[in-house]
Every structure is written in C-alpha cells, then in structure tokens.
C-alpha cells in the first residue's frame, strides 16, 4: 500500500523557485502525476495540519512542513490524480479531468546550512563554560522562520536582549542575522509580532528566561563580546528581528494573460489570492523579475500600471521593492492599481 510514509515513495514540488515549496507531484508506476487537493475526501478549499506531510519534506531534504493545502494557482501537467482512503495514501488513485483538479500545495521550511539546536538549554545552576555562546530566534507559534525575539545563551545562562529604540545597532543586527544563518537584517519587529506576549497556559520551557542581556558592543565580530548580563527588566523592549531569510515568502501568480508568463499580478495572503496593488516607491523591474522567476518564466519584458478608476478596487500592498522582502502584506480597500506584467516565455 503506497503512501508518502513509504521509504521508496517519490515526490517533488514544482511551480515555484524553491524545491521546498510548490505544487505536489508524485511518481507512480507510469510517471509523474499532479495531486489534486480534493484527494482523500477533502474539499479544494480545505487546509490540513501540515505536520502530516513531514515525511515528504524530509525526503526532499527540506525542513519542517509549514502549510499543506490548495496550491490555488494550478498548472496542469499531462496527468493529475485524485486519491482515496487515508490522507497521504496513493494506492487507490484515479485520473482526474484537468479542469476539475485544484492542485495540492506543500510548503516546507528551506533547509538550514547547518542545524542550530532547536530546543532551549534547560535552566541549570551548573556552569558550563565550555558551551560556545549561541543565539536563537523565538517565533510566535505558527510564526515565521528567521523572525522573532532574539535569545542569547552563554554557557548555562540564556535570555532576551534589552533593546532601546535609539540604539544605533545596524551592524549588530546584520551580524546576528548572519550568525543565525538567516541572511541580513531587514527590520525590528514589534514584540506583539515577534511573539513575546506570553500565553499563561504555555508550557514552562516557553516562559520568559531568568537572564537578560544588554548590548555591550554593537560592532562586535564574535558573540561573546556583544552582550553583558543585566538584572531582568520588568518593562522595556527586547530585541526582536526580521531577517532576509524569513520563511514562508509571499507567493505570486499571473492571471488573465494569454499564457502563464503574462497577466495581472496576484499574491497570496493565507489561503486567499488578491491583486497586488502598485506601489510607486517600488515601481521597478526588481519586483517583477522575482515574479517572473516564480512562474518559471524568463526575464521581465514590460509592465503596465492599470488605472484604478474604481474607488472600491481592493488588493494587497507591499511597501518594499522586492516581494521577497515583504513579511506582511497590507490590505488596500480602495483605488488599488493592478499591474499587468509580461515575462519572456521560456519556451517560445
């Protein structure tokens, strides 16, 4: 009985610029097939607990699964299948009409170059001077990878870092993001976004740590020289960062064009797709190159900002030049100017 738990099961994720997210395709005896999200009695709008697909992510050498559900932008290959029985079982599948199939999408965490420890060191009174100092980013539950409250551990001591908004620390933030293998620093997160607010029912290991640190040298080049221990503060901000390696990234698609390589740009917020509104401050091919690449098309040829004559036209807005820098999309409820992008067709 073939299922995605079997050791010889073969899968791939397509239609994105990462091997760790995209449309799920599986290899059965007669070739590769796209899996419809209506499989296993699900509806094409239903989202699953992604942890059920952890074996697939593992097999693709990716990190933990972040989302499992309708991919929403369906590119139908030669063959699509609907499967029956238990979730993840492929022993009873039938071919589906392409126009009836909504593809199943899976997003796994991109693999880290080296795996930092995933658990906090337990509070202990025994000094461990040999343990090298290290950092950890603590995200909200369901939050993003490479985004969250920074915790610093030195030996057995660990805790958050006190941060004042006036601190001039850009070099330090870049150093920290880099040390965490999360790219470069993008911005500070408000604590609500970073997940500092504590749920009273949360398990003990996620309660605030007893130690706090203060930035000692914002130009430090090794962790042991960056911070000094202070008495924990009841109030005040803690350092919370968003780094460029955050995941998952905004997904995009082109709709309403004559091919998959042209159309009005839409982006995904949760399970919903909506128009991406023009941003005059980010009006450059830098943004559209990323979109073209995500559609697996060639370089951007042209783009047209469509007039928003209708005051009720709505959509989503990203203030950054590159969509990959957008960790949140803002809703625009009026005068959303859509953008029609034409990319080079990779197979003219």
């Amino acid at each position: 009985r073939l299922s995605w738990y079997d050791p010889d099961f073969q899968a791939r994720l397509t239609r994105s610029n990462s091997k760790c997210q995209g449309q799920l395709e599986v290899y059965l005896k007669d070739g590769w097939h796209m899996v419809c999200s209506q499989s296993w009695g699900r509806s094409s709008k239903q989202w699953e607990d992604p942890s059920q697909a952890s074996k697939v992510c593992q097999r693709l050498n990716c990190g933990v699964p972040l989302s499992l559900g309708p991919f929403l932008v369906t590119y139908t290959p030669q063959s699509s299948i609907i499967c029956y029985g238990q979730l993840g079982s492929f022993s009873n599948c039938s071919h589906s009409r392409n126009d009836m199939c909504h593809s199943l999408g899976l997003t796994c965490l991109e693999p880290q170059k080296t795996t930092p420890p995933t658990t906090r060191p337990p509070p202990t009174t025994t000094p461990e001077p040999t343990a090298p100092p290290r950092l950890q980013l603590v995200a909200q539950s369901g939050g993003q990878h490479c985004a969250g409250v920074v915790e610093f551990y030195s030996g057995s001591l660990g805790g958050t870092i006190s941060y004042e908004a006036q601190d001039k620390t850009q070099d330090l933030e870049n150093f920290l993001c880099n040390n965490l293998q999360c790219g470069s620093f993008l911005k500070h997160l408000p604590e609500t976004e970073a997940g500092r607010a504590q749920d009273p029912g949360e398990p003990r290991e996620h309660q605030p740590l007893p130690i706090q640190w203060k930035i000692q040298n914002s130009s430090c080049t090794s962790l042991e020289h960056c911070f000094r221990k202070i008495k924990p503060q009841k109030s005040g901000r803690v350092l919370a960062l968003l780094c460029s390696g955050f995941q998952p990234k905004v997904q995009s698609r082109l709709v309403g064009g004559s091919s998959i390589c042209e159309g009005t740009v839409e982006v995904r917020q949760g399970a919903q797709w909506a128009a991406l509104c023009d941003s005059s401050s980010a009006r450059s091919s830098l943004r559209w190159e990323e979109v073209c690449r995500e559609q697996q098309c060639g370089s951007v040829n042209s783009y047209r900002v469509l007039d928003a004559g209708d005051p009720t036209s709505r959509g989503l807005f990203c203030p950054h030049q590159k969509l990959s820098q957008c960790h949140e999309l803002w809703e625009r409820n009026s005068y959303c100017k859509k953008v029609f992008v034409t990319c080079q067709d990779p197979n003219p």
Partner: nanobody, 121 residues
Framework: EVQLVESGGGLVQAGGSLRLSCAAS????????MGWYRQAPGKQRELVAA????????NYADSVKGRFTISRDNAKNTMLLQMNSLKPEDTAVYYC??????????????WGQGTQVTVSS
Amino acid sequence: EVQLVESGGGLVQAGGSLRLSCAASESTFSITAMGWYRQAPGKQRELVAAITSPGGSTNYADSVKGRFTISRDNAKNTMLLQMNSLKPEDTAVYYCNADINHGSGYYTVSWGQGTQVTVSS
C-alpha cells in the same frame, strides 16, 4: 528602444576589484530604475544590485553587501558597479537592465548583452 552596453568585465584574482559600467543609448530621463544581475553557468539569473531614480534608493543581494557599490551618473547616461573583495563565487556573466517609462503607466525593460567576470582563486 534603449540599448544598454556593459563593459569593464575581465579576469581578476580573488580579493581584487573591478568596475563595471553600463551605458544607455539615450537620455536617462525616461529611465526610472537600473540594475545589475548575474548568471553563473547552470544557475538562474540573480539580482546583484539595483538603483531607482530620482531618489537613488539602492538594493543589494545579501552576498554582495559591503563589497559592491552601485551608482548612477545621469550626466553620462551610465550606471556603475564597483566590485571590491571579489570572490571566486562572483564569477558570472553580469547583465545590466533599465526600466523605461513610456508614460501612462507603461514601462518596458531593456537588457544588455552581458559582460563576463571571472575571479580566479
């Protein structure tokens, strides 16, 4: 159509410097943004650095931050990329691109033919 011509590529040792130039065939008045991209054999084309006008805000790939500097010389219709502390992984064909504003919200994107940069170890 705006023609873009890159120059300044070549062979350099690791740790060395190069200065790439991209010349536009007509006034940069209608050019709203310019960028440098690179493509190594068997890899996707990737952003190196970009600059918008008139604000001149810049954007760099993480891998080149602190080593490369992009700038524009509007008087000469050129864009420059100063590349310092070059590494073997910077080896690629470097392309420049420009966004041309045709009015009424319509922009086309022109690409140069590329210039080869090879960094030996």
